[in-house]
């Protein structure tokens, strides 16, 4: 029987991405996401 | 693009203050926002400090918050950052940048200009 493992050997690397809320409306104050595999989840 | 040119750069004691200036050419200066980042020997450049076209909102790394202060003079096309309790740690080539409406603010790879830098060596 195949052994299987959680572990592929991928790391999935995040990065936090400020925003200004400004650049898409008329709020002040910054917007944070977070970016996971290249795809922004928050 | 706007072209940026950074001074204000020295020597100075550990706790001491420095205020750095960027000199934006260009009539598009208030289509920007812009940042400060530093970049120290055998370093990434890293984020230090944003802030928005409109001067009204700021945002800061961990490293520098309550120390530094960025503010922008959209009359003079300037940019500056005043620089307060400085560490050893904080010694590098501060750069300062442009970055597009709806870029990421913090991540150098969203600003198109940038300036040739300016030196900040925090030393006793």
């Known amino acids: 029987d195949a052994e299987f493992r959680h572990d592929s050997g991928y790391e999935v690397h995040h990065q936090k991405l400020v925003f200004f809320a400004e650049d898409v409306g008329s709020n002040k104050g910054a917007i944070i996401g977070l970016m996971v595999g290249g795809v922004v989840i928050a | 693009e706007v072209q940026l040119v950074e001074s204000g750069g020295g020597l100075v004691q550990p706790g001491g203050s420095l205020r750095l200036s960027c000199a934006a050419s260009?009539?598009?200066?208030?289509?920007?926002?812009m940042g400060w980042f530093r970049q120290s020997p055998g370093k990434e450049r890293e984020f230090v400090a944003t802030?928005?076209?409109?001067?009204?909102?700021?945002y800061y790394a961990d490293s520098v918050k309550g120390r530094f202060t960025i503010s922008r003079d959209s009359a003079k096309n300037a940019v500056y950052m005043q620089m307060n309790s400085l560490k050893p740690e904080d010694t590098a080539v501060y750069y300062c940048?442009?970055?597009?409406?709806?870029?990421?603010?913090?991540?150098?790879?969203?600003?198109?200009?940038w300036g040739q830098g300016t030196q900040v060596t925090v030393s006793s």
């Open positions: 802030i928005s076209r409109s001067g009204g909102s700021t």
């Open positions: 940048a442009a970055a597009r409406i709806g870029a990421a603010v913090n991540i150098p790879s969203e600003y198109g200009s």
């Open positions: 260009g009539r598009t200066f208030t289509s920007y926002n």
